[in-house]
């Protein structure tokens, strides 16, 4: 049986199937209090109106309470991410109550039917919370609903129906089909909890978007633009065009939200930061690495509630696996002049050298044309912590090797057969670290020699005036 939510075509088919005839009464939603990290342990099933299981199972009324809500499934068995999330929560919050909301019987349906069941499941959770609120010391402010995919919208309904306001809802790639563009009362929204944070990892502007594209929380984080996740390509997932490849890619990207959240729980010392930006393209240009006015935040469990923020879109890059943290840099390169460039688009490569480590050679992604006699901004990121930057090596090549660009290059060469050599003139590079918020200017090692031909290298060192620190501190200090 294929994994949930995939392949895309299969889900598309599901959406157009007629409603199945229900021959038996649907079983109720079950609440399993995971009293042990041991997966073999049966846990305790909580029952509305029955206080004995709460006492028998050591439900801690004053502690945080997590409700984990799974999504639609094409299988009758829990998916593997659930164990990882429960275990991570137990590790991070040792005294907390971790409750698994088992609505498999209602989720293991046609997708449209499962969607129609989200409301009733949300209502069940709300009733459980209302009952718990009658107990001494239990506070709705300590409740954190964590919903994956369709489960994120279930959490939204629960937050909407409960008497009072739950402390937090985390939406892990909330489902897109039948929720995109829906009214706020029919999907997860910022009104559903005191703080609603959302991770979007499988959004598509073309074809079927498994995850919802629109912002639905107080903060909406789009790792890697919210679409193509590193390590989830066809080659990464199976290495060959075997059966179920597309299914695996869908599962990998959709489920990445869960693993990013797990990462934030277990790798507390390696927090990932996201940066507020109006759109993905602007972020890719490197112009959104500011932490001023609460424009950056930790992702996942460590996210901080921002006052007066709603539908704030935030972006970051990540590694392909845990720990997902990368180090973001904004690079501003002023190209003073082109020499004999014809129609060739340059592609820049930098290597960063730091006190802790050196980076690999990193390509600077061109979002728009390189402008001459203008400052061009780029985003680069490294998987390792380089420490304080010491020097930068810059190289460039002609256009990327597409057939069109090869033709352009050949045409340019033929039109200028005696081309004396293409050159760019770059005198300095300004760098800002997203993680530390430090700004530095790097000057050409040889101020008399700032022209660079394709394949040649130019070295830049910290300028004499060295560390140009603005009144911006590290996000770890600044975040509320």
């Amino acid at each position: 049986s294929p994994t949930p939510f995939g392949p895309e075509g299969q889900l598309a088919d599901e959406l157009h199937k007629p409603k199945a005839i229900q021959t038996e009464v649907k079983p109720s939603v079950r609440f399993n209090l995971r009293t042990s990290k041991d997966p073999e342990h049966e846990g305790c099933y909580l029952s509305l109106g029955h206080s004995q299981p709460l006492e028998d199972c050591g439900f801690n009324m004053t502690a945080k309470t997590f409700f984990i809500i799974h999504g639609w499934t094409m299988s009758g068995i829990f998916e593997n991410w659930l164990h990882k999330l429960v275990s991570a929560l137990h590790t991070r919050e040792k005294d907390a109550n971790v409750v698994v909301v088992d609505w498999l019987p209602l989720a293991h349906q046609l997708y449209t039917d499962a969607v129609n069941n989200t409301r009733v499941v949300g209502h069940s959770i709300a009733r459980m919370l209302d009952w718990l609120q009658e107990k001494d010391d239990f506070s709705l402010g300590n409740v954190h609903l964590i919903g994956y995919s369709l489960g994120a919208h279930v959490a939204g309904y629960a937050g909407n129906f409960v008497k009072g306001t739950v402390g937090r809802i985390t939406g892990l790639d909330p489902a897109g089909p039948m929720f995109e563009g829906a009214d706020i009362h029919k999907r997860l929204s910022p009104d559903d909890a005191d703080f609603v944070d959302v991770l979007h990892t499988y959004t598509r502007s073309f074809g079927l978007s498994i995850g919802i594209q629109m912002p639905v929380g107080h903060i909406d984080i789009y790792p890697n633009g919210g679409d193509f996740q590193p390590g989830c390509g066809l080659n990464d997932v199976l290495g060959s065009m075997a059966y179920g490849t597309i299914t695996e890619v869908v599962k990998c990207e959709h489920e990445r939200a869960v693993h990013l959240f797990v990462d934030s729980l277990v790798n507390q010392d390696k927090p990932s930061f996201a940066f507020q930006c109006t759109d993905s393209n602007r972020f890719k240009k490197g112009i959104c690495l500011s932490c001023r006015k609460n424009r950056c935040n930790s992702i996942g469990y460590n996210a901080k509630k921002m006052r007066n923020k709603r539908n704030s879109k935030m972006y970051l890059k990540t590694r392909a696996g845990m720990p997902f943290r990368v180090y973001h840099y904004q690079m501003k390169i002023h190209v003073f002049s082109y020499k004999n460039m014809g129609e060739i688009e340059p592609t820049f490569y930098v290597t960063l050298y730091g006190t802790n480590a050196d980076s690999q050679t990193l390509p600077l992604e061109i979002v728009e044309r390189i402008e001459q006699n203008a400052t061009n901004t780029f985003l680069v990121y490294t998987e390792e912590d380089l420490g304080d930057l010491l020097k930068i090596q810059l190289t460039w090549e002609g256009a990327s090797q597409s057939w069109y660009n090869l033709w352009k290059e050949l045409r340019s060469y033929l039109s200028q057969p005696h081309n004396p050599g293409r050159e760019l003139n770059i005198r300095r590079i300004r760098v800002k670290s997203g993680e530390t918020q430090r700004k530095l200017t790097f000057c050409a090692e040889d101020p008399e020699n700032t022209s660079i031909s394709p394949g040649r290298e130019l070295w830049f060192r910290k300028c004499r005036d060295g560390w140009r620190m603005k009144n911006e501190t590290s996000p770890t200090v600044e975040l509320p």
Epitope: N32, H41, S75, I77, H83, P105, H108
Partner: antibody, heavy 119, light 107 residues
Framework: EVQLQQSGPELLKPGASVKISCKAS????????MHWVKQSHGKSLEWIGG????????TYNEKFKDKATLTVDKSSSTAYMELRSLTSEDSAVYYC????????????WGQGTTLTVSS | DIVLTQSLATLSVTPGDSVSLSCRAS??????LHWYQQKSHESPRLLIK???QSISGIPSRFSGSGSGTDFTLSINSVETEDFGMYFC?????????FGGGTKLEIK
């Protein structure tokens, strides 16, 4: 004490069908998934599929989707696997195994049911 | 499907030796790997779950390690009762799959 008691050996002709049973005791039957595993003579193990006894939801290995059907009888805490259109390739030992809460690992196994398909 | 490779089909050891059995996954499976021992004409027995979690009733000489794609089952000072087949199994994604097995035999 958790126990999984499987039905006895079967000798059947090609084309026939068989229903193997696995009676569970010592735990709450509906709280854990039940899985079925095939082991051909001298070979490794192959996961056939699993069932959630709470409501009968199943998941299958694509390879066995047209071969096996998993069911449960909650009243007797028994899981069943029916194998149809038998061929000599289906000759093997079949095990039922109790999954953990998440259905991932199998701490308890039945004693195995030997199926021989021969004309 | 995720392929689990147990590179050594047979491992010959002397009682008292310490051994390591390896299992490699064709893609990242995090810690969703379990180890089983099977003796002739017996059902498999769970030794280690989720890469490194011990099982009650299993001797402490058995331990597991690894994450991602490379996993190891270690037996500290092998005893005669430890000889038999060892299988790894992944539960990261369906279909769940088993390795081909490593036979631990007396040298």
């Amino acid at each position: 004490e958790v126990q999984l008691q499987q039905s006895g050996p079967e000798l059947l002709k090609p084309g026939a069908s068989v229903k193997i049973s696995c009676k569970a005791s010592g735990y709450t039957f509906t709280d854990y998934t039940m899985h079925w595993v095939k082991q051909s003579h001298g070979k490794s193990l192959e996961w056939i599929g699993g069932i959630n006894p709470y409501y009968g939801g199943t998941t299958y290995n694509e390879k066995f989707k047209d071969k096996a059907t998993l069911t449960v009888d909650k009243s007797s805490s028994t899981a069943y696997m029916e194998l149809r259109s038998l061929t000599s390739e289906d000759s093997a030992v079949y095990y039922c195994a109790k999954g953990d809460y998440y259905g991932g690992s199998y701490n308890y196994w039945g004693q195995g049911t030997t199926l021989t398909v021969s004309s | 499907d995720i392929v689990l490779t147990q590179s050594l089909a047979t491992l010959s050891v002397t009682p008292g030796d310490s051994v390591s059995l390896s299992c490699r996954a064709s893609q990242d499976i995090s810690n969703s790997l379990h180890w089983y021992q099977q003796k002739s004409h017996e059902s498999p027995r769970l030794l280690i779950k989720y890469a490194s979690q011990s099982i009650s009733g299993i001797p402490s000489r058995f331990s597991g390690s690894g994450s991602g794609t490379d996993f190891t089952l270690s037996i500290n000072s092998v005893e005669t009762e430890d000889f038999g087949m060892y299988f790894c199994q992944q539960s990261n994604s369906w279909p769940y799959t088993f390795g081909g097995g490593t036979k631990l035999e007396i040298k």
